[in-house]
């Protein structure tokens, strides 16, 4: 902790300016009034405060606002934002997208994923839902940040906003997040024609259930292998060889390359070998001919 000393009269600070960079740590702590600092936060980022001096300034703001900084201060944090921990940010209430933009710009190129995720979470909470303006801001200033939100937060996205989401914004989304986003996307794109619908829904398909994947297989969509590999394992396993062949179209040959990777590997293990042989790809590992398959999970459910 920074030691308390009294401020020498000649060092008294009446405004936040560049002369402060020559203050030693103790002088800065003793001479800078926290309320003055908060009132003149807009000046701080233009002053090349050292890494160590920023610690002192943060300490002052923490003392002045133990319950969390007001948005008037947060908006002007600049590089001081990079000193914040997720715990600090959790105390904030942020509603302005200008504040979000300013801090996303500052954090670019720095390892701040946990802090940015927490910040976005606070913005969604502050604004009440993940509205179109927020999504537009995230896609513009922080591609991939949408996926930093929890499934609970993503559930507040209205289907009407889904159209603003680009494929690259979903690259880092996990299955639980896509489970939430897929039904919204399905609803948002439901009035589109087959090929247009598939282009739009494709980035969200990691959240699709089996019946929807089966339906796609009837529409000549020629799904690429990358999309197929992102499908939920549970959605792929019930598909027949004929359905997968129809779903992938000319891309079916890619199954050989992915033979050892989930969900292809798991799907192969569930198919009859003679059905797999009809593909002519040399896929191995299916159920040998003449074997009887007992689905014990069904029997257990019935008993």
């Amino acid at each position: 902790d920074v030691e308390r000393t009294t401020c020498p009269p000649e060092k008294e600070v009446h405004e936040i300016d560049e002369s402060l960079i020559f203050y030693k740590k103790r002088e800065l702590e003793a001479c800078v009034d926290a309320a003055l600092l908060a009132a003149q936060m807009d000046r701080v980022d233009a002053i090349p405060f050292t890494y160590e001096q920023l610690d002192v300034l943060k300490h002052k703001l923490d003392e002045l606002y133990p319950q969390g900084y007001p948005e008037s201060v947060i908006r002007h944090l600049g590089h001081l934002f990079l000193k914040m921990s997720p715990e600090d940010i959790r105390k904030w209430n942020v509603t302005s997208l200008e504040t979000l933009k300013a801090l996303l710009k500052v954090s670019k190129g720095h390892e701040m994923s946990a802090q940015v995720a927490t910040l976005i979470d606070r913005v969604v909470v502050g604004r009440g839902q993940l509205d179109k303006d927020t999504v537009d801001t995230l896609t513009a200033f922080c591609p991939g940040c949408l996926c930093s939100l929890s499934p609970e937060r993503l559930s507040s996205v209205p289907p009407s906003v889904i159209g603003a989401v680009r494929p690259q914004d979903l690259d880092t989304c996990g299955p639980r997040q896509l489970d939430v986003l897929y039904p919204k996307a399905r609803l948002a794109f439901q009035n589109m024609s087959g090929s247009e619908y598939f282009v739009k829904i494709r980035p969200f398909l990691g959240g699709a259930p089996t019946e929807d994947v089966k339906a796609l297989s009837q529409q000549n969509v020629s799904m690429d292998l990358a999309t197929f590999m992102k499908l939920r394992r549970e959605a792929v396993l019930p598909l027949t060889v004929a359905e997968v062949q129809k779903l992938l179209g000319p891309h079916v040959e890619g199954l050989k390359v992915e033979e050892q990777h989930s969900p292809v590997r798991d799907w192969i293990l569930k198919q009859r070998q003679d059905d797999l042989d009809t593909l002519g790809l040399g896929l191995q590992g299916g159920i040998p001919n003449g074997y009887l398959i007992l689905d014990l999970s069904v029997r257990e459910a019935l008993s």
């Epitope: 030691e3 203050y23 740590k25 090349p48 050292t50 890494y51 160590e52 920023l54």
Partner: antibody, heavy 120, light 106 residues
Framework: DVQLQESGPGLVKPSQSLSLTCSVT?????????WNWIRQFPGNKLEWMGF???????NYNPSLKNRISITRDTSKNQFFLKLNSVTTEDTATYYC?????????????WGQGTLVTVSA | QIVLTQSPAIMSASPGEKVTMTCSAS?????MYWYQQKPGSSPRLLIY???NLASGVPVRFSGSGSGTSYSLTISRMEAEDAATYYC?????????FGGGTKLEIK
Amino acid sequence: DVQLQESGPGLVKPSQSLSLTCSVTGDSITSGYYWNWIRQFPGNKLEWMGFIRFDGTNNYNPSLKNRISITRDTSKNQFFLKLNSVTTEDTATYYCAREGSYAPAWFAYWGQGTLVTVSA
Amino acid sequence: QIVLTQSPAIMSASPGEKVTMTCSASSSLSYMYWYQQKPGSSPRLLIYDTSNLASGVPVRFSGSGSGTSYSLTISRMEAEDAATYYCQQWSSYPPTFGGGTKLEIK
């Protein structure tokens, strides 16, 4: 990886100006860091001279304030040192360096250095 | 400006020996930085934020300290560690370096 390379005349006459260039690859000089000049005297003493910030603003060592100027050319990704009214005391190896954080703290990347001799 | 004083100015150590050098500041600091310089080369960052190892630096190097007293330790001296070591602060302007500790191999 970030690389810095100093260049400029190795010999300067007293009272003239010393001008050096630092060419940067692997990072943009507008990308949010501080780009510094540091010199090392023949006795190995190191002295920070000044920096130009990502936004083009400067800060200089008070001991050199009236003689030093650091500028940049963002299109070439270069920054420059100009030291006026040199004396033999300015004979040193001059390094350009980028600090390693978002605020002035430590020097993570250094050029290989260029020896400048001030002599008549 | 803050003055950094390194000691000893020159020292020698045998391979495998533990080496400790110190850096004393004229004013209290939160962080200290350490560099290694070999003849004909530019300084290389070893330690940042007092105790964090820079990328690619062997784990035999470590830094510690607080306030006005800091140290750099090499747990087991190796021939390639023969060099001059500098401490540096940027607590306030201007940043300053220590005068260096020259480490020789016995």
